[in-house]
């Protein structure tokens, strides 16, 4: 049988065959970080020969060669220094604007191993536009310097390099120019996960529920779909399966997107998936069509039975036939729900095409994309019913242009991208949607992503303190109140001097607010049993603060989602006419239901929540505590149906100072707070002033270690009382 | 779906102040995608632009008025104002409002008649 | 400033294919917009950025712009396209509308 021949190495480099030495085997060459290979592959042809892509001589030896970035081209009103040709990576220019022009975008920018600049384009402007100077990004020349209402600025790469992003721009009414920033790039280069995922998270989230369902004022900011409870999202993964696709990278592929699928259903926002496998020929695995595709179950298995040899017999890439199956399922969609319907005309489409390589057959997938704008009438009023992201994976055949051609283009978003392999593929979906990149007011909402921060990952946890040393933990329930425990409160001092520190993107301290007022519930007592031998008692142990200013959403400042109201029901995905006993049923369903809260150091700590039997059991170990309740007859007269319990097996306990913050438990990626600490039998910091130190209890310590939490399900009344104005509360 | 709707006197003295108002309804007139302006049209004539206010209440005006015009905002009721100094009979036209999103006149009011009587 | 040049009138014969063109220098490098005026009533925009057509629009309304010219296409004429048509383009943060067609279904 014919094959190639094996003397194919790259100096400095590696290489991989997807169908060993056979004809039609493609080999990829890869080199270290900061090169990059050329050729960057070869095809085994059934000559027994190797093929180079766009080469002139069959055979050139593979090399790995230095990764540079694009020089500035010019720069206007004012300098950049050095004046290279082009820049190693490691690499810095530096930019400085004339004499009344303001720097917006970054002084100095490196040059990075992927052969993208970091930071942002600098930009020398006076603000004399109606929009703003768009800049010139490096390795640009733009045409047109005027920047009012209707004018139009055009852009060319220089050299080899390539645009992404749009060519022309114009100057709209609201100051914004139309599409997306211009960058000219290597066509070698590609792109970091960590660019990427908050790049299509960003643009992605304003389709995930970005404005609050419930929010009482529907003003609009920026570019911010809004997905009301009637609204709908149509999204189509359509997944390359051709012959340079391996088998292994077809399966990150399917794992993927059943990420990607996964974190849309934990939204509040009623979702349709298609699923579209493609080589030569697409295959409809999952239609918007069928009910089954607003199942997670449903479509997460369609996609598990996605099978790599479904496209044995068809080999090549064929976009165009994978984009126009989305374009008939939309018009069979049309005619069956009516053109000119509210049912049809509010449904968003998002479309995400994976893809190793550029199409090679059935002709230009643009016509396709041209087909669906068509058909949704899509518009300036209604560029926000369709977003296409295109998305090339592996440095090889993936044709920029193209990519970028396919894309939307929306100012401040990016739709194409290049990936360098299916891991980086895999990272970008586990991070995209990590929306804690919302700006509103979406609540439970924390950054699951391995590399975020502690404050990032519980948005909600703030930290109350007097004057001097830091006191108690509460939680952000919406954007100027805090839910955190009355005991905080019990010297009664004035409220004036205390601080509430709420996290800030800008600060890895934070931000300190001043309460404007602190609801402490009148039930409240410490001493109100002392006759009875009960020493301290902690019934009703919950207090409200409202700040003195909103709280500015970001990353870092996000409410947590409570149980029974609106809010917290659309973020389960109940159904509409769900009651406050539902949400118990759903979040405490378990004799041991595992929770969370939230260390002195940030870091999220875990719980079980005892309920039913277990609760009893769990609460028993009250009466062997003989300091603070030495004549204790009745435990349930310390431990009421008003605390939840936890504390048994490997539970970690909270210390004094972690009192009031929430406890809470996750659901379908977003978090609920069932519960804030109260009391307990044991505080693991005693004697520590290191907030990372805690000491378990040791296994014979009589009482053995438990703690208390308020139960948010049983302070229905009081917190209705006061929360009436700010949730929207369910039914009981 | 944003309707506008101008108000204001039908008949103006030459050299006095001509003042419509325009209402919209269906949607805030602060929203940033949206821009706002005057266009007239003298009988049997084309359509001429008078000026633009934008959310950020910038303006621009059609040269031609030489400083006669003043467009304003006044969001508590939804509304935007045009107040056209020193007129003359050359001043009579059916004058629109219009709203845009993005670079074009997408939505009209259905014109009002202003006559300038000597 | 920036002048926009319309025929006065252009005619068509029913079903037939009517083009009205918009002058302008290096017009190609602005967008242009369309709006139809029917007798009595508000004008209505029917192609924006020289070849888009807003919802509502019927698929005979097409647009085109190249070097110094501006083409509003109206195929298969209707009695109801009878009325004036007019080009637009922003210059500056300034509008200008190009002076009218007049355009008669036969």
């Known amino acids: 049988a014919t094959s190639c021949p094996q003397n194919v190495n790259i100096s400095g480099g590696t290489f991989t065959l997807s169908h060993g030495w056979a004809p039609g085997s493609l080999l990829i060459y890869s080199c270290p970080q900061g090169l990059y290979p050329s050729p960057a592959s070869r095809l085994c042809k059934s000559s027994g020969q190797w093929q180079t892509p766009r080469a002139t001589r069959s055979l050139t030896k593979a090399v790995c060669k230095p990764v540079r970035c694009p020089a500035p081209v010019s720069f206007e009103n004012g300098i950049y220094t050095p004046r290279l040709g082009s820049y190693p990576v490691g690499g810095n220019v530096s930019f400085e604007c004339e004499d009344g022009f303001i720097l917006r975008g970054s002084p100095v920018r490196q040059c990075r191993p992927n052969g993208m600049w970091d930071g942002e384009t600098a930009v020398c402007d006076n603000g004399a536009g109606h929009c703003p100077n768009p800049g010139i990004s490096l390795g640009a020349v733009r045409t047109g310097s005027r920047f009012g209402h209707g004018d139009k600025v055009r852009y060319r790469c220089s050299s080899n390099l390539v645009l992404t992003g749009s060519a022309e721009r114009e100057c709209q009414g609201n100051g914004v120019w139309s599409g997306t920033e211009p960058i000219c790039r290597q066509p070698y280069s590609y792109d970091f996960p960590e660019d990427v995922a908050p790049a299509l998270g960003t643009s992605f989230s304003h389709m995930l529920g970005a404005t609050n369902p419930t929010q009482r004022t529907k003003e609009s900011l920026g570019r911010k779909i809004q997905i009301q409870r009637s609204g709908h999202l149509n999204l189509y993964l359509l997944l390359d399966s051709s012959q340079s696709v391996s088998e292994n990278d077809f399966l990150i592929f399917k794992e993927s997107a059943s990420l990607m699928v996964d974190r849309i259903f934990s939204f509040e926002i009623n979702v349709s998936v298609a699923i579209i496998t493609f080589a030569s020929e697409p295959k409809v695995l999952m239609s918007v069509l069928n009910v089954n595709s607003r199942d997670i179950t449903e479509v997460i298995s369609s996609l598990e039975n996605a099978k790599y040899k479904d496209h044995e017999n068809g080999t090549g890439t064929n976009t165009y036939a994978a984009l126009n199956s989305v374009y008939l399922m939309m018009n069979n969609q049309m005619q069956l729900l009516g053109m000119k319907t509210m049912a049809w005309q509010e449904i968003r489409h998002a479309i995400i095409l994976l893809t190793d390589g550029k199409s090679n057959m059935g002709g230009s997938p643009k016509t396709a994309v041209d087909q669906i704008r068509e058909i949704l009438n899509i518009n300036q009023k209604r560029n926000d019913y369709l977003d296409i992201y295109a998305i090339g994976v592996g440095k090889l055949d993936v044709d920029w242009r193209e990519l970028n051609e396919l894309g939307s283009k929306k100012d401040g978003e990016r739709h194409a991208f290049i990936l360098q392999d299916t891991k980086a593929l895999h990272q970008v979906f586990e991070h995209m949607l990590d929306v804690s990149k919302l700006t509103d007011t979406i609540c439970g909402v924390g950054n699951m992503s391995a590399n975020a921060s502690d404050q990032e990952r519980t948005p909600w946890h703030v930290t109350i303190k007097p004057k001097s040393q830091e006191t108690c933990r509460g939680a952000l329930i919406s954007d100027q109140w805090v839910l955190t425990a009355a005991h905080c409160f019990r010297d009664g001092n004035d409220h004036s001097l205390w601080r509430v520190n709420v996290g800030d993107p800008k600060s890895q301290w934070g931000k300190e607010f001043l309460i404007e007022k602190a609801v402490i519930s009148p039930g409240f007592d410490v001493f109100a049993k002392k006759n009875q031998g009960i020493l301290e008692f902690y019934g009703d142990d919950i207090a409200l603060l409202k700040l003195a200013q909103k709280v500015k959403m970001s990353t870092h400042a996000r409410p947590i989602c409570l149980p029974c109201t609106m809010e917290a029901n659309l973020a389960l995905r109940r159904p509409q006419g769900s009651t406050c006993r539902d949400h118990e049923n759903e979040l405490l369903n378990k004799q041991s239901v595992p929770a969370h809260f939230v260390a002195l150091n940030g870091s999220k700590l875990n719980i079980n929540l005892k309920m039913g039997v277990e609760w009893t059991s769990c609460a028993e170990v009250v009466s062997q505590e003989k300091t603070m309740f030495p004549n204790l007859t009745d435990v349930r007269e310390v431990v009421t149906d008003q605390f939840l319990c936890s504390g048994t097996q490997e539970d970690e306990s909270p210390c004094k100072g972690e009192s009031g913050g929430a406890v809470f438990l996750e659901r379908r990626f977003r978090f609920f707070q069932v519960g804030l600490v109260s009391w307990g039998l044991y505080n693991p910091c005693l004697g520590s002033a290191d907030k990372n130190s805690r000491k378990r209890a040791p296994r014979s310590k009589v009482p053995p270690p438990r703690d208390f939490h308020i139960n948010l399900f049983r302070m229905q009344p009081w917190l209705r009382q006061h929360l009436g104005d700010v949730l929207n509360f369910l039914p009981l | 779906q944003l309707q506008l709707q101008e108000s204001g006197p039908g008949l103006v003295k030459s050299s006095e102040t001509l003042s419509l108002t325009c209402t919209v309804s269906?949607?805030?007139?602060?929203?940033?995608?949206?821009?706002w302006g005057w266009i007239r049209q003298p009988p049997g004539k084309g359509l001429e632009w008078i000026g633009t206010i934008y959310y950020s209440g910038r303006t621009y005006y059609n040269p031609s008025l030489k400083s006669r015009g003043t467009i304003s905002v006044g969001t508590s009721k939804n509304q935007f104002s045009l107040k056209l100094s020193s007129v003359t009979a050359a001043d009579t036209a059916v004058f629109y409002c219009a709203g845009g999103v993005g670079v074009t006149w997408d939505y009209w009011g259905q014109g009002t008649l202003v006559t300038v009587s000597s | 400033s920036y002048d926009l040049s319309q025929p006065l009138s252009v005619s068509v014969a029913l079903g037939q294919t009517a083009r009205i063109t918009c002058g302008g220098n290096d017009i190609e490098s602005k967008n242009v917009h369309w709006y139809q005026q029917r007798p009595g009533q508000a004008p209505v925009l029917v192609i924006y950025r020289n070849s888009n057509r807003p919802s509502g629009i019927p698929e005979r309304f097409s647009g085109s712009n190249s070097g110094n010219t501006a083409t509003l296409t109206i195929s298969r004429g209707q009695g109801g396209d009878e009325a004036d048509y007019y080009c637009q383009v922003w210059d500056s943060s300034t509008v200008i509308f190009g002076g009218g067609t007049k355009l008669t279904v036969l």
């Open positions: 269906g949607g805030p007139i602060s929203s940033s995608s949206y821009y």
